[in-house]
């Protein structure tokens, strides 16, 4: 039975040209995290594997940095980076947990962070 929950940074906004940290946290389970995949819509951005470490998509090699922790840092943001991001936690023995973050990249200099929310 899957008892865990994923807490994410929720709906967030950031300025064009700036950077943002995408964070998820898995709680309420003793399952072992074997790998975390970060995806943007259907595109794989990065993988953090317990054995193999971090591997970043060549398409994002200059704009994506691993961490902090199991999070992901997006740099040199453009308006095209607006959209849904998913953290996919592969765990044993529970299986897969998915968290969703919506990022809006703003032209303006005012970028408010949204509240945290949980996905069971």
């Amino acid at each position: 039975m899957m008892t865990g929950t994923i807490e994410t940074t929720g709906n967030i906004s950031a300025e064009k040209g700036g950077s943002i940290i995408l964070q998820c946290h898995l709680s309420s389970t003793t399952a072992q995290v074997t790998q975390v995949n970060w995806e943007q819509q259907d595109q794989l951005l990065a993988i953090c594997n317990a054995d193999l470490g971090w591997h970043i998509s060549p398409s994002f090699k200059d704009r994506v940095a691993p961490g902090p922790g199991l999070g992901l840092t997006l740099q040199s943001l453009t308006v095209n980076d607006t959209g849904e991001y998913f953290c996919i936690y592969h765990t044993y023995p529970d299986g897969t947990y998915t968290g969703r973050i919506f990022l809006e990249v703003l032209e303006s200099s005012v970028a408010e962070h949204g509240a945290r929310f949980q996905i069971p």
């Epitope: 790998q35 995949n37 794989l44 054995d51 470490g53 591997h55 998509s57 060549p58 897969t96």
Partner: antibody
Framework: EVQLVQSGAEVKKPGASVKVSCKAS????????MHWVRQAPGQGLEWMGL????????GYNRKFKGRVTMTVDTSTSTVYMELNSLRSEDTAVYYC?????????????WGQGTLVTVSS | DIQMTQSPSSLSASVGDRVTITCKAS??????VAWYQQKPGKSPKLLIY???NRYTGVPDRFSGSGSGTDFTLTISSLQPEDFATYFC?????????FGGGTKVEIK
């Protein structure tokens, strides 16, 4: 035209090491991951690990950890796979394979293979 | 590790036959599955990626389908050059793993 050209067949004694090379051409070498996959005679395919020529980042299948090392020479667009402490079960054809453009974990081009025979 | 169980391990078919090969993953791999063709003494060649996307230059008689744990490679009308061994591969989770292969032989 993308080409991956591997070094020639090797015969090694148990306990020895082997170093197989894979020279890439026809594309931007640092834009794609390279993987190593082996195939024992008459058997299936086994993934050994990957290396990213852009930053020399590596990741190894835990089955081979401590015995395998993957390296890159960007000046010659060549990747190397060295396997230590050889045993008879390591007799196989070793392939380098380029990671795909949309996801680096499937293989769109393969080298011709290098037969490594381990025999006393 | 994710096990990819491929079936059948071999099959005999005639030119013009419709051939179906299946691959079952031991856990959900979404659509991160590729299919390869390998002829004796040769390197594998990519046929399908993302479960159903035909790779450049691959004839349209080859098609892939499935998601989650169950995947299928179909050859709609077998041609003489299609007699070979076919492998599936999952690429959701490291270590990357392959099915055991299906050898397609001439009946």
């Amino acid at each position: 035209e993308v080409q991956l050209v591997q070094s020639g067949a090797e015969v090694k004694k148990p306990g020895a090491s082997v170093k197989v090379s894979c020279k890439a051409s026809g594309y931007t070498f640092t834009d794609y991951y390279m993987h190593w996959v082996r195939q024992a005679p008459g058997q299936g395919l086994e993934w050994m690990g990957l290396v990213y020529p852009y930053n020399d980042n590596t990741g190894y299948n835990r089955k081979f950890k401590g015995r395998v090392t993957m390296t890159v020479d960007t000046s010659t667009s060549t990747v190397y796979m060295e396997l230590n402490s050889l045993r008879s079960e390591d007799t196989a054809v070793y392939y380098c394979a380029r990671g795909g453009p949309s996801n680096w974990n499937y293989f769109d081009y393969w080298g011709q293979g290098t037969l490594v025979t381990v025999s006393s | 590790d994710i096990q990819m169980t491929q079936s059948p391990s071999s099959l005999s078919a005639s030119v013009g036959d419709r051939v179906t090969i299946t691959c079952k993953a031991s856990q959900n791999v979404v659509t991160a599955v590729a299919w390869y063709q390998q002829k004796p003494g040769k390197s594998p060649k990519l046929l399908i990626y993302s479960a159903s996307n035909r790779y450049t230059g691959v004839p349209d008689r080859f098609s892939g389908s499935g998601s989650g744990t169950d995947f299928t490679l179909t050859i709609s009308s077998l041609q003489p050059e299609d007699f070979a061994t076919y492998f599936c591969q999952q690429y959701t989770l490291y270590p990357l793993t392959f099915g055991g292969g299906t050898k397609v032989e001439i009946k």
